[in-house]
């Protein structure tokens, strides 16, 4: 029987900068029941606080609701593991909520084949930002990435769309059914999951771009 091993806070995520959750990995338990507590203070403060919610994020997590979440302030947090034989502390983790946003996938993905008379045909892809993200305030810049592939192909073709919410693709295989998905990330932050796939049938007379 031993004191617990050193835990590690390995991930923090926020869906929208209004709330966030951090997760830790326990160290070895030393063969004894072990209690974990997360304590934190904000940059410039000395007063320590305990995690406000150990439940919402699941096991080995701490959830910070709206009233506990401040943008532009660094949180300095650590996890304490304690059993009958002693305690161990994780390294301190410095967290700025602005940098840990992982948004929901983009919405309303629409895909259409356009065949203008005077120009080459193209695939037109359009989408909307996730609803939880408020782009109007200027706090967020969302970047988008599109991936597509013929239904039976193994490899995805990836296009970076920057900040735009529509995109044109010229080079496609005629007669193929394509899957199209889009995802987004804040300028600092994490990629969302891919949106649900939208399928589009490319007409047989679609002219391949040179």
């Amino acid at each position: 029987q031993l004191p617990p091993g050193k835990p590690e806070i390995f991930k923090c995520r926020s869906p929208n900068k209004e709330t966030f959750t951090c997760w830790w990995r326990p160290g070895t338990d030393g063969g004894l029941p072990t209690n974990y507590s997360l304590t934190y203070h904000r940059e410039g403060e000395t007063l320590m606080h305990e995690c406000p919610d150990y439940i919402t994020g699941g096991p080995n997590s701490c959830h910070f609701g709206k009233q506990y979440t401040s943008m532009w302030r660094t949180y300095i947090m650590m996890v304490n593991a304690t059993n009958q034989m002693g305690s161990s502390f994780s390294d301190e983790l410095y967290v700025d909520v602005t940098y840990i946003v992982q948004p929901d996938p983009p919405l309303e993905l629409a895909v259409e084949v356009k065949q203008p008379e005077d120009r080459k045909p193209y695939l037109w892809i359009k989408w909307s930002p996730p609803t939880l993200i408020d782009l109007k305030t200027g706090w967020f810049t969302l970047l988008y990435e599109i991936r597509l592939k013929p239904e039976k192909a193994a490899e995805w073709e990836i296009h970076f769309a920057g900040q735009q919410t529509e995109f044109k693709i010229l080079s496609l295989h005629p007669g193929q059914k394509y899957l199209v998905q889009v995802r987004c990330k804040p300028d600092h932050g994490y990629w969302s999951a891919w949106s649900p796939a939208t399928f589009i049938q490319i007409p047989s007379d679609f002219t391949m771009n040179d």
Epitope: R25, G44, L93, D96, T98, Y99, I100, K185, Y190, W191
Partner: antibody, heavy 120, light 107 residues
């Protein structure tokens, strides 16, 4: 204990490439951005770029955009910086540096440095 | 890019005295400034982040202040191990940039 251990010194010819490695231990590699900074002999520090090991998303100093390539190998917790078309002015100590937290780009842990000498 | 200008280039101070190092940004950077110490043959060591916050384990004799474009690192009472080169760094906008350094030497 957090450690960043870099590969050994290199001597390269002008026009060639160099690839410096940085093996991380003591923390979850994918949690923190990794940065690369260089220091020419007797000079100050110059930021080359940064990479997020969780998804290999990277940002570069425009000065190095066309010549530097940052990559990671998650299976070995190793970051790499490749610099191509080397010239004598690229002679410097190259450092990897871990982001201080999940936040802005200040650097709390540094590798020991790798001296790259470019000479004909 | 934002240019960080440090002064003086060299500062000669006696042990136990106070050292004040200056760093000026060419554009507004808020408090997005860090300070590092570097000794010969070693990698830099983080001292201060967010202009005024001491990093874990850094002695209280090191303090940072300033916001906007003017920043100061103060070492209240220089110890023998503090003689080194000090760099400021801004992380307000890409590319992240460092000052040219201030060498603190024994008077």
């Amino acid at each position: 204990e957090v450690q960043l251990v870099q590969s050994g010194a290199e001597v390269k010819k002008p026009g060639s490439s160099v690839k410096v490695s940085c093996k991380a231990s003591g923390y979850t590699f994918t949690t923190y951005w990794m940065h690369w900074v260089r220091q020419a002999p007797g000079q100050g520090l110059e930021w080359i770029g940064e990479i997020d090991p969780s998804d290999s998303y990277s940002n570069y100093n425009q000065k190095f955009k066309d010549r530097a390539t940052l990559t990671v190998d998650k299976s070995t917790s190793t970051a790499y910086m490749e610099l191509s078309s080397l010239r004598s002015e690229d002679t410097a100590v190259y450092y990897c540096a871990r982001n201080g937290g999940l936040g802005p780009a200040w650097f709390s842990y540094w590798g020991q440095g790798t001296l790259v000498t470019v000479s004909s | 890019e934002i240019v960080m200008t440090q002064s003086p280039a060299t500062l000669s101070v006696s042990p136990g005295e106070r050292a004040t190092l200056s760093c000026k940004a060419s554009q507004y950077v808020g408090t997005a400034v860090a300070w590092y110490q570097q000794k010969p043959g070693q990698a830099p060591r983080l001292l201060i982040y967010s202009a005024s916050n001491r990093y874990t384990g850094i002695p209280a004799r090191f303090s940072g202040s300033g916001s906007g474009t003017e920043f100061t690192l103060t070492i209240s009472s220089l110890q023998s191990e503090d003689f080194a080169v000090y760099y400021c760094q801004q992380y307000s906008s890409y590319p992240w940039t460092f000052g040219g350094g201030t060498k603190v030497e024994i008077k």
